[in-house]
Interface confidence: low
């Protein structure tokens, strides 16, 4: 049965030319993490493999780090990364959880994170 | 057309050595993982060799193991294999092939249509 | 012998459904993705499932596949005589650090 819940950075925004760290945790499992994937939509971003490491897709090399821990830093933001991200956790031997991040890039110097919630 | 093209093979005596090219054509060569596979005669898929996008990160089959060299060169588009104190047990048709999605183990989703090497006296 | 265990033949008749079983371990199909690929005689493999359920563009939705805890399956539904080829399934093994591939299932249209 799957325990786990995934706690993430929920909606947030960020100006436009800056950077945001996209972050989920899962917790309540003891199942063992073996991947976690970065999409936005169906477009992989990044994975982080727990045998072979972090893994960028050739697309976003430029403008995506790996880290903080399995979160991702998203730099140089644009309008046009505004939308939803997913961080998905392969786990063994509970299987896939999801968690989804909602981020907003402004045009103007006002940003604020929203709250933290949690998808179970 | 993304397409891999195997050569190289051939008829080669015990001990003896070869070298299996695999060019690449319709795709950034070097934003993938690449693999080799093979299939001795009448058998199942055999897994063979990965290496990573620019050649730091290479994985072998135990049975190849300090016997076989992956390497590619990004900059020809091609992927290699040296084969060094070849045996019997490594005639087959050796593939190419390329990691789906750029993203390693997802699954390999381009084949070549694959070389043979016979290991014979 | 192969890390992953299927069985050597199934059959059906044009239009059944069929069910190709993989076995694995943890270290395999437990802990990472299964790919399946199918192989008609005198061919190349090509991809049917990667990411355990996921069709490259170009295979027919009649192949769909699942996985639970250390096995897979592949599912073939309406049956059809082009289908009558050796179908594998593969998956990268941390322990051996390379991918493992089953010993390959036969599938005869009858």
């Known amino acids: 049965m799957m325990t786990g819940t995934i706690e993430t950075t929920g909606n947030i925004s960020a100006e436009k030319g800056g950077s945001i760290i996209l972050q989920c945790h899962l917790s309540s499992t003891t199942a063992q993490v073996t991947q976690v994937n970065w999409e936005q939509q169906d477009q992989l971003l990044a994975i982080c493999n727990a045998d072979l490491g972090w893994h960028i897709s050739p697309s976003f090399k430029d403008r995506v780090a790996p880290g903080p821990g399995l979160g991702l830093t998203l730099q140089s933001l644009t309008v046009n990364d505004t939308g939803e991200y997913f961080c998905i956790y392969h786990t063994y031997p509970d299987g896939t959880y999801t968690g989804r991040i909602f981020l907003e890039v402004l045009e103007s110097s006002v940003a604020e994170h929203g709250a933290r919630f949690q998808i179970p | 057309e993304v397409q891999l093209l195997e050569s190289g093979g051939g008829l080669v005596q015990p001990g003896g050595s070869l070298r299996l090219s695999c060019a690449a054509s319709g795709f950034t060569f070097s934003d993938y993982y690449m693999n080799w596979v093979r299939q001795a005669p009448g058998k199942g898929l055999e897994y063979v060799a990965s290496?990573?996008?620019?050649?730091?990160?290479?994985y072998y089959a135990d049975s190849v193991k300090g016997r076989f060299t992956i390497s590619r060169d990004n900059s020809k588009n091609t992927l290699y294999l040296q084969m060094n104190s070849l045996r019997a047990e490594d005639t087959a048709v050796y593939y190419c092939a390329k990691d789906q999605n750029w993203n390693f183990y997802y699954g390999m989703d381009v084949w070549g249509q694959g070389t043979t090497v016979t290991v014979s006296s | 012998q192969s890390v992953l265990t299927q069985p050597p033949s199934a059959s059906g008749t044009p239009g059944q459904r069929v069910t190709i079983s993989c076995s694995g371990g943890?270290?395999?199909?437990?802990?990472?993705?299964v790919s399946w690929y199918q192989q008609l005689p005198g061919t190349a493999p090509k991809l049917l499932i990667y990411?355990?359920?996921k069709r490259p563009s170009g295979v027919p939705d009649r192949f769909s596949a699942s996985k639970s805890g250390t096995s897979a399956s592949l599912a073939i539904s309406g049956l059809q005589s082009e289908d009558e080829a050796d179908y594998y399934c593969?998956?990268?093994?941390?322990?051996?650090?390379?991918?493992?591939f089953g010993g390959g299932t036969k599938l005869t249209v009858l």
């Open positions: 593969a998956s990268w093994d941390g322990s051996l650090r390379g991918w493992v």
């Open positions: 943890s270290s395999n199909i437990g802990n990472n993705f």
């Open positions: 290496i990573n996008w620019n050649g730091g990160t290479t």
């Open positions: 990411n355990e359920i």
